[in-house]
């Protein structure tokens, strides 16, 4: 899977959207690596 910073950002946005935004406060692109997915 793509692990560039931009891919991580878009994947996280999708995850936040699907979860209704209910995730930990520090779950942001600069805090998570691609392995977080």
């Amino acid at each position: 899977a793509c692990d560039t910073a931009t891919c991580v950002t878009h994947r996280l946005a999708g995850l936040l959207s699907r979860s209704g935004g209910v995730v930990k406060n520090n779950f942001v692109p600069t805090n998570v690596g691609s392995k977080a997915f």
């Epitope: 793509c2 560039t4 931009t6 950002t9 996280l12 946005a13 942001v28 692109p29 600069t30 805090n31």
Partner: antibody, heavy 119, light 107 residues
Framework: EVQLQQSGPELVKPGASVKISCKAS????????MNWVKQSHGKSLEWIGD????????HYNQKFKGKATLTVDKSSSTAYMELRSLTSEDSAVYYC????????????WGQGTTLTVSS | DIVMTQSQKFMSTSVGDRVSVTCKAS??????VAWYRQKPGQSPKALIY???YRYSGVPDRFTGSGSGTDFTLTISNVQSEDLADYIC?????????FGGGTKLEIK
């Protein structure tokens, strides 16, 4: 409102260095990567690199290694790009850009900084 | 580095028409392509990410499609304000790379 405000135009001599700034507002600066992009006159775009404002980590385009240095100042929510050993080939418009998710999911770009290298 | 080729440097269209701008990647980049519009004298503005998803505020006249190596940006019901350069970008691999742009001219 998310904004990326870049520093003003620069006219510098060959061989000199310059530091361009990009001040972020309207979102949490440390949450999102900051990208830097070069646009030479009449040409398309070249990605220089990105910086993680949370920890200062960087990815560089090999072409710009040794030419560009990307840093951040978290206290002022400002990203910087220093360009060194300038030549006429470095004359261009330089943009900062960041994809945010909160408060809005969008890919924001600064207004651009024009760099002219001339003796 | 991945080369993004926009073979048509210029395209001419009329208000109300539909036009398709194409972009070809030198290797498989999955769906990880963005499209930007750059009006003369302005910064690029993001339109599409992940090949086919519009950013908020982008009119639904703009549609992206494709995956792998072949990508298309379609503009339906072209407006006079669509006079601009349209540029693709891949972000599947570092370094990110951009196409050379397609300049849309309005007849």
């Amino acid at each position: 409102e998310v904004q990326l405000q870049q520093s003003g135009p620069e006219l510098v001599k060959p061989g000199a260095s310059v530091k361009i700034s990009c001040k972020a507002s309207g979102y949490t600066f440390t949450d999102y990567y900051m990208n830097w992009v070069k646009q030479s006159h009449g040409k398309s775009l070249e990605w220089i690199g990105d910086v993680n404002p949370n920890n200062g980590g960087t990815h560089y385009n090999q072409k710009f290694k040794g030419k560009a240095t990307l840093t951040v100042d978290k206290s002022s929510s400002t990203a910087y790009m220093e360009l060194r050993s300038l030549t006429s080939e470095d004359s261009a418009v330089y943009y900062c850009a960041s994809i945010t998710i909160v408060p809005v999911y969008f890919d924001f770009w600064g207004q651009g900084t024009t760099l002219t290298v001339s003796s | 580095d991945i080369v993004m080729t926009q073979s048509q440097k210029f395209m001419s269209t009329s208000v109300g028409d539909r036009v398709s701008v194409t972009c070809k990647a030198s290797q498989n980049v999955g769906p990880n392509v963005a499209w930007y519009r750059q009006k003369p004298g302005q910064s690029p503005k993001a339109l599409i990410y992940s090949a086919s998803y519009r950013y908020s505020g982008v009119p639904d006249r703009f549609t992206g499609s494709g995956s792998g190596t072949d990508f298309t940006l379609t503009i339906s019901n072209v407006q006079s304000e669509d006079l601009a350069d349209y540029i693709c970008q891949q972000y599947n691999y570092y370094p990110y790379t951009f196409g050379g742009g397609t300049k849309l001219e309005i007849k």
